[in-house]
Interface confidence: medium
C-alpha cells in the first residue's frame, strides 16, 4: 500500500500490516482496518483487524486459533455438502473452485426439489436453491441440508424439530432450529453458514428482499393452493380496512460516514418509490440514530402515507444531525419505533390487529452502547401479540429486515434482529454502500416491474440507455439519397412511436433501421403505420410547402422486445400505467390525466438529444398558458411559412410549442431529434406527452448546436392527447390499458 508506513489517527503503526496479493484500507479513523482482495479471493486469516489500546493490531488468528505471521489473499472456495440425504451429488471433492458445478441426483422413489445443478459463485456461495430429495412421507416436506450446514433430526412429523450447525469459524444465518408446524410448513427460515468474507451480491439481495417484501405487500389470495413440490407461500388476504406501517431506521453513527449516509438515503427513496409502484399507500416512520435516535416522520402524522412528502423529508435529513453524539445505539432506535407502534393509554385503537408492520434497519454493524436491541424486538412482538397463540401466531404482522453494510457487520447480531420466515430472507450483508445502492436499483428493476412504463435506472453506473431506456434510434437508408436520422420511443413490446415525416411512402421496411438499448443490431420491422390524417403535401395548393399536422407514426416490430434495464417502455397518456405512475386513484379519467400532465401554464418537460454519440436530456418548457399564443405565432419565421396569413393554418390544435427565452432560454431540437418523445418527468416516472415534429430555426447547421439562437426559435410537437383514438386503435393488443 502506498501509505504503508504512515501512522493512522489511532495509535497503531501500519508497519507490517500489508496483505500479500491485496491491499488494506483504514476504517473508523484508523481504529480498524479492512483487508481488500481481488474478486475471487478472500483475506486469510481475517478480514478486519482492530487497533488495540496497547498500540498493536489484533493478532492474525485462523479459525482454529493458530497465529499467522502475514495476511494473504487466498482463492475463494465454496463449501462441499457435508451431507446429502436420499441421493447423490457429483462430482465429489473436498472443496470447489469458483465456477465449478455440482449436480444432485435422487435415489429411486425420491423427487428432487430445488436446483439439480449448482455453480460455485465468486462470493463463495452456491448458485440456485438447496437441493432436497424427498419422498413426501413426512407431515412436513424434508427441510433439506443447505450446503455447508449439518442437520440433526430426520423425522418430519407435526411438531418434530430439526437443528442446524456450522463448522467452527462460520456463522449461522437464519434459523438454527426449525419446527414442523400445522399446515405442513417449517417455522423460521432456511439456515446458511457464512464466512466473514461472504457478502450477498446485489442481485441476490434484490431478489430475496423483493420476493419477501412482495409477499408482505401484495397479499396472495387465501384460496390459492400451491402446486406439488412447491413450498407454501405465506398467504395474507388484504383486509380493505387493514393497513401497513413501514419504519425506516437508518444508522447515522460515525463509522457510516457522510457519503454512505447519502447512499442509504438514496436506497430508501428507491424503496418508497418501489412500494408506491405496487399501488399501496403505507404509513411511514422515519428514524435516524447514533447515540440517540431522531424521529423525522411519525406514522401518526397526516402526511406519513404521502410518498412524495416522506421522500422530501428523507432527502432533507443531514448526516451532520448526529455529529456530536456518534455512538451506535440500535436499541434506542428500535425503542423509538416501539413508541410509534404503541398506543396512548394502552388502549388499542380499532383495527390495531389488522395493521402490518415492516421495520427496515440499515446499519454498518456493531451496536456499541445501550444494550442488546433484541429485547426491543421481543417487546414489539409482545405488543403486537405475535407468537403467543399457537393457532394464530400472527407472524405475518411483523417483518424486520436488516441490511448490514461493510466489513464490520456482526453477523450474529444482525441475524438475531431479523425476522425468520419460511422461504424468505430478512437479513442481508452487502460489501459496501455502492452494493446496497445496486440492490435498490435492481429491486426497482425486478422482472415484475420491467413492464412498468417510464421507469429508469438512475444509477451511478448507468449508461445512456439505462437513463433513457425507451429511446430508439431510427435511420432510413435511401439509395442515392443518403439517409435520414430520427428518434423514437418504445411504447410497448412491439411498437416504437415516432414522427411520420421520417419516412416517405416509397421507403421499404428493409431500408428502415431501428435500434434500442444502445444495441448495435437493428430490429426487423413488420410495418410502419402512419396516422391516416397525415399528409405533408396536404396544403401545397394553399402555398404551404410542408404541412405537419398529425405527424405521428408507429413502427411495428417483427419480434417482441425483451425488456431489461436498457430497454423498457415510456408511459403514454390515458393508460392505466400512467395512472399508476402518477399515483392517481384507479378511477382517474383521461381528462384528469391531461389536467395533471398539461395544465394551462408553462410546463417543465424534456427531450432527449444525441450529442457526440451521447444521449443527453434537454429541459424545455411547454408554453401552455399565457405564452402559448406568442410561441405559436413565431411559426411564421419558419422557412416557407412567411406568406401564411393565419398561423393556425400550420399550427393546428395538434401541436405543443416549446422554445424561446421565457420563462427560461429553452434548448432547441435538431433534425435528428425528430420523432423522439417530449416528456414530462413526474414522481420519478417519465410520461410522453408529445412527438418532436418540426422547428422554426435550424439551430444545428454543420452538426453543431448553436449557442446563440433568436428568441423566435421555437419547436413544435404533436400532442399525444390529440391523437389518442388512433393510438388506442393501433395499440389495442398491447395491454396498455387505455382509459
Amino acid at each position: 500500500t502506498p501509505w504503508s508506513l504512515a501512522r493512522p489517527q489511532g495509535s497503531c503503526s501500519l508497519e507490517g500490516v500489508e496483505i500479500k496479493g491485496g491491499s488494506f484500507r483504514l476504517l473508523q479513523e484508523g481504529q480498524a482496518l479492512e483487508y481488500v482482495c481481488p474478486s475471487g479471493f478472500y483475506p486469510y486469516p481475517v478480514q478486519t483487524r482492530t487497533c488495540r489500546s496497547t498500540g498493536s493490531w489484533s493478532t492474525l488468528k485462523t479459525q482454529d486459533q493458530k497465529t499467522v505471521r502475514k495476511a494473504e489473499c487466498r482463492a475463494i472456495h465454496c463449501p462441499r455438502p457435508h451431507d446429502f440425504e436420499n441421493g447423490e451429488y457429483w462430482p465429489r471433492s473436498p472443496y470447489y473452485n469458483v465456477s465449478d458445478e455440482i449436480s444432485f441426483h435422487c435415489y429411486d422413489g425420491y423427487t428432487l426439489r430445488g436446483s439439480a445443478n449448482r455453480t460455485c459463485q465468486v462470493n463463495g456461495r452456491w448458485s440456485g436453491q438447496t437441493a432436497i430429495c424427498d419422498n413426501g412421507a413426512g407431515y412436513c416436506s424434508n427441510p433439506g441440508i443447505p450446503i455447508g450446514t449439518r442437520k440433526v433430526g430426520s423425522q418430519y412429523r407435526l411438531e418434530d424439530s430439526v437443528t442446524y450447525h456450522c463448522s467452527r469459524g462460520l456463522t449461522l444465518r437464519g434459523s438454527q432450529r426449525r419446527t414442523c408446524q400445522e399446515g405442513g410448513s417449517w417455522s423460521g427460515t432456511e439456515p446458511s453458514c457464512q464466512d466473514s468474507f461472504m457478502y450477498d451480491t446485489p442481485q441476490e439481495v434484490a431478489e430475496a428482499f423483493l420476493s419477501s417484501l412482495t409477499e408482505t405487500i401484495e397479499g396472495v389470495d387465501a384460496e390459492d393452493g400451491h402446486g406439488p413440490g412447491e413450498q407454501q407461500k405465506r398467504k395474507i388476504v388484504l383486509d380493505p380496512s387493514g393497513s401497513m406501517n413501514i419504519y425506516l431506521v437508518l444508522d447515522g453513527s460515525d463509522s457510516i460516514g457522510a457519503s454512505n449516509f447519502t447512499g442509504a438515503k438514496k436506497c430508501l427513496v428507491n424503496l418508497i418509490e418501489k412500494v408506491a409502484s405496487y399501488g399501496v399507500k403505507p404509513r411511514y416512520g422515519l428514524v435516524t440514530y447514533a447515540t440517540y435516535p431522531k424521529i423525522w416522520v411519525k406514522v401518526s402524522e397526516a402526511d406519513s402515507s404521502n410518498a412524495d412528502w416522506v421522500t422530501k423529508q428523507l432527502n432533507e435529513i443531514n448526516y451532520e444531525d448526529h455529529k456530536l453524539k456518534s455512538g451506535t445505539n440500535t436499541k434506542k432506535a428500535l425503542q423509538a419505533v416501539y413508541s410509534m407502534m404503541s398506543w396512548p393509554d394502552d388502549v388499542p385503537p380499532e383495527g390495531w390487529n389488522r395493521t402490518r408492520h415492516v421495520i427496515i434497519l440499515m446499519t454498518d454493524g456493531l451496536h456499541n452502547m445501550g444494550g442488546d436491541p433484541i429485547t426491543v424486538i421481543d417487546e414489539i412482538r409482545d405488543l403486537l401479540y405475535i407468537g403467543k397463540d399457537r393457532k394464530n401466531p400472527r407472524e405475518d404482522y411483523l417483518d424486520v429486515y436488516v441490511f448490514g453494510v461493510g466489513p464490520l457487520v456482526n453477523q450474529v447480531n444482525i441475524n438475531a434482529l431479523a425476522s425468520k420466515k419460511d422461504n424468505e430472507q430478512h437479513v442481508f450483508k452487502v460489501k459496501d454502500m455502492e452494493n446496497l445502492e445496486d440492490v435498490f436499483y435492481q429491486m426497482i428493476d425486478e422482472s415484475q416491474s420491467l413492464s412498468l412504463c417510464g421507469m429508469v435506472w438512475e444509477h451511478r453506473k448507468g449508461t445512456d440507455y439505462h437513463k433513457q431506456p425507451w429511446q430508439a434510434k431510427i435511420s432510413v437508408i435511401r439509395p442515392s439519397k443518403g439517409h435520414e436520422s430520427c428518434m423514437g420511443a418504445v411504447v410497448s413490446e412491439y411498437f416504437v412511436l415516432t414522427a411520420a415525416h421520417c419516412f416517405t411512402v416509397d421507403d421499404k421496411e428493409h431500408s428502415i433501421k431501428v435500434s434500442v438499448g444502445g444495441e448495435k443490431r437493428d430490429l426487423e420491422i413488420e410495418v410502419v403505420l402512419f396516422h391516416p390524417n397525415y399528409n405533408i403535401n396536404g396544403k401545397k395548393e394553399a402555398g404551404i410547402p410542408e404541412f405537419y399536422d398529425y405527424d405521428v407514426a408507429l413502427i411495428k416490430l417483427k419480434n417482441k422486445l425483451k425488456y431489461g434495464q436498457t430497454i423498457r417502455p415510456i408511459c403514454l397518456p390515458c393508460t392505466e400505467g400512467t395512472t399508476r405512475a402518477l399515483r392517481l386513484p384507479p378511477t382517474t379519467t383521461c381528462q384528469q390525466q391531461k389536467e395533471e400532465l398539461l395544465p394551462a401554464q408553462d410546463i417543465k418537460a424534456l427531450f432527449v438529444s444525441e450529442e457526440e454519440k451521447k444521449l443527453t436530456r434537454k429541459e424545455v418548457y411547454i408554453k401552455n398558458g399565457d405564452k402559448k399564443g406568442s410561441c405559436e405565432r413565431d411559426a411564421q419565421y419558419a422557412p416557407g411559412y412567411d406568406k401564411v396569413k393565419d398561423i393556425s393554418e400550420v399550427v393546428t390544435p395538434r401541436f405543443l410549442c416549446t422554445g424561446g427565452v421565457s420563462p427560461y432560454a429553452d434548448p432547441n431540437t435538431c433534425r435528428g431529434d425528430s420523432g423522439g418523445p417530449l416528456i414530462v418527468h413526474k414522481r420519478s416516472r417519465f410520461i410522453q406527452v408529445g412527438v418532436i415534429s418540426w422547428g422554426v430555426v435550424d439551430v444545428c447547421k454543420n452538426q453543431k448546436r448553436q449557442k446563440q439562437v433568436p428568441a423566435h426559435a421555437r419547436d413544435f410537437h404533436i400532442n399525444l392527447f390529440q391523437v389518442l383514438p388512433w393510438l388506442k386503435e393501433k395499440l389495442q393488443d398491447e395491454d396498455l390499458g387505455f382509459l
Epitope: R92, S93, S99, F104, H105, A116, N117
Partner: antibody, heavy 120, light 113 residues
Framework: EVQLVQSGAEVKKPGASVKVSCKAS????????MTWVRQAPGQGLEWMGW????????KYAQKFQGRVTMTRDTSISTAYMELSRLRSDDTAVYYC?????????????WGQGTLVTVSS | DIVMTQSPDSLAVSLGERATINCKSS????????????LAWYQQKPGQPPKLLIY???TRESGVPDRFSGSGSGTDFTLTISSLQAEDVAVYYC?????????FGQGTKLEIK
Amino acid sequence: EVQLVQSGAEVKKPGASVKVSCKASGYSFTDYYMTWVRQAPGQGLEWMGWINPNSGGTKYAQKFQGRVTMTRDTSISTAYMELSRLRSDDTAVYYCARGYYANSAWFAYWGQGTLVTVSS
Amino acid sequence: DIVMTQSPDSLAVSLGERATINCKSSQSLLQSSTSKNYLAWYQQKPGQPPKLLIYWASTRESGVPDRFSGSGSGTDFTLTISSLQAEDVAVYYCKQVYNLPWTFGQGTKLEIK
C-alpha cells in the same frame, strides 16, 4: 438404444492439436453429462474430465488443465474433446462415456474409442 | 489425488475356479451419511471399451452374470468371480468417484491357467 459414435483415428505431429467428436443418439443429449477417458497403449484408464451438455459447464482433471477443451453442439447431439500442444505420451485411445442417470459417475455407455497417434 | 492400487497385476485361474482381485484406496471411499462406498469395477476385453460390472462397491450392473460380486468397505475392496468362464478373460479396473479427480487402479490382467 443409447449409442455413442466417435470420430476416426488421427495421426498428429507433436505440438499440434486434435479434436475428437462423440455423436450421441438414442437419448436426450442435454440430459446426461459426457465424460472423457483415455488409455495409452498397454496402460490403464485415465479420467480427463466431463462436460454438462445442457449448460456447457466443464470439469477437467488438473493434469490436462490448460490443454484440454471440452465443448458440445446440442443441435447435432455431439460432444467434442480437443487436446492441444500434443506430446508423444498423448498417444492413446480416447473414449467418451455416459453415465446411467443425468450426472452419474458410473459409466454405463462408452464410445468405441478414437486412437490418436502423436509422432514426428 | 486418491491413489487406487490393485493386486495382483496379473492372475491366472483355471476354468470353473474362483478368481479374486483386490483394490486398495489411499483414503476411505465410505460416505458415512449414506453408508455407501464410492467404488466401481470395470471389465475391458482387448480392442473394446470398458464395461461397467459393479458400482457402489457391491451393486451388480443389470445384465452382469451373478458369478461377479463386489465386496469391501472404506479402503479395501474385492472383486470375486465365483466360477471363471472363458469369456471372463480381460483386464479388470477399479475406479473411485469419492473425490475429484476420479481415478482408476492400474488394472489386473486375468487369464486362464
